[in-house]
Amino acid sequence: SERCDDWGLDTMRQIQVFEDEPARIKCPLFEHFLKFNYSTAHSAGLTLIWYWTRQDRDLEEPINFRLPENRISKEKDVLWFRPTLLNDTGNYTCMLRNTTYCSKVAFPLEVVQKDSCFNSPMKLPVHKLYIEYGIQRITCPNVDGYFPSSVKPTITWYMGCYKIQNFNNVIPEGMNLSFLIAFISNNGNYTCVVTYPENGRTFHLTRTLTVKVVGSPKNAVPPVIHSPNDHVVYEKEPGEELLIPCTVYFSFLMDSRNEVWWTIDGKKPDDIPIDVTINESISHSRTEDETRTQILSIKKVTSEDLKRSYVCHARSAKGEVAKAATVKQKVPAPRYTVELACGFGAT
């Protein structure tokens, strides 16, 4: 057979689906690898072929499209399971070809089991809600294309094991779940179960997402440098270790990059010929506000180092701030026998 452009195993598309539920999987060739869509390919006389390799096997085999009730079928560039079974887990390949052209890609499909509270090994999308911010909604994800718009499914929302109904600040509204006002107590896993009829059968789609309540943009402020500050003086003798912490508080801001850095005499520490190390630690509050601490450390400080300017800088989407540390050389305490005696005019 002629050469085939093999895009290998597309592990970026780690597809997970629930056991005993419908699943529609689009051939990734048209989404990520080729510059044309299925309709164009079909019009050009190209054929889409599907096959698979079972879990823990090496043998590629054709997909059986003659199962009872068309359990597995293909429609255009979509592979359908109505429904999935646990042993459908494996690597699936879609190949587009004619007599002169061939391109294929494989992707892993994992059929997972869920428990009575919708826990499973499935990776969950995270939806962030702002704390005490007014009405916000989450939408039941990835249900498009499963049933026509003429079909009116029933949607039930759960938090963990429990159905959400008549609750004062969380209201199920069909495909949406509205949070009239979000609190920390609303953190958790929310599941929508979509039930729809098809050809005399009833199917269920289960979709779970994690809600994380985060700091509101209403309360967001520019970075706040807690240390260094005007109340602390770093007084050292040459040869001692100099440790200066830079501690910065960042309000939560969606998609903001928080940065902290030191300058020494206006330059990056790497550009200064001294042995300096910087260690960073990060902690988060319950609403994902962030505190970053960068400790600047010079093991054996010289009198030259004690004359330098040490400035902590911080930046977020809300602004940039800087604060200099007060560093001094310790004045040695006078030795009584010589200095004080001389001072008192002793001969």
């Epitope: 646990l86 089991q113 509270c117 919708f118 826990n119 938090m159 094991c161 429990y162 959400i164 107590s185």
Partner: antibody, heavy 119, light 107 residues
Framework: QVQLVQSGAEVKKPGSSVKVSCKAS????????ISWVRQAPGQGLEWMGG????????NYAQKFQGRVTITADESTSTAYMELSSLRSEDTAVYYC????????????WGQGTLVTVSS | EIVLTQSPATLSLSPGERATLSCRAS??????LAWYQQKPGQAPRLLIY???NRATGIPARFSGSGSGTDFTLTISSLEPEDFAVYYC?????????FGQGTKVEIK
Amino acid sequence: QVQLVQSGAEVKKPGSSVKVSCKASGGTFSSYAISWVRQAPGQGLEWMGGISAIFGTANYAQKFQGRVTITADESTSTAYMELSSLRSEDTAVYYCARHLHNGIHLDYWGQGTLVTVSS
Amino acid sequence: EIVLTQSPATLSLSPGERATLSCRASQSVSNFLAWYQQKPGQAPRLLIYGASNRATGIPARFSGSGSGTDFTLTISSLEPEDFAVYYCQQGKHWPWTFGQGTKVEIK
């Protein structure tokens, strides 16, 4: 330290109802759910149902549906289990137990409440 | 509902010996299974969740294994305080159900 403290033992007549309380302390009540499990003398454990402390919605075992009502009062961090139309075979120790909203294992248990149904 | 069958009903062993308790489900429960210990006059105590994860404060001598329909609780070396009744519980399907228990008694 999480603690679930249940109400005291009860003696009831057949056909009557009993309401057992379970007060939680040492954790955020609204972050958890409370299940009720019973154990007849010398027998095993039987899950009756559970309630979400934040949403106040309950799940019940089919066997007890219509006869058991589980409620929660967030203001007092207390869950309640009411069993009606009592019969002698309902004589058992009734336990409340805590679990996460999406948890299927019961990590903290109350001390148990003995309910005796006798004419 | 899912029926959990524990075996043996009673296990007679001496301190220091290894105990192996079995729990079999009437259909697959994946790894959605927990084990509890109950001593006379006390409430049950969670030992293992997710078939193999030890709960907080549970000694390392307790371990769980299995997936699907067959599960095992192993106590590597019995201590005097381990003599009790052990229950398995599934959470794969409603209603949650328990096994009938295995009593571990001193020989």
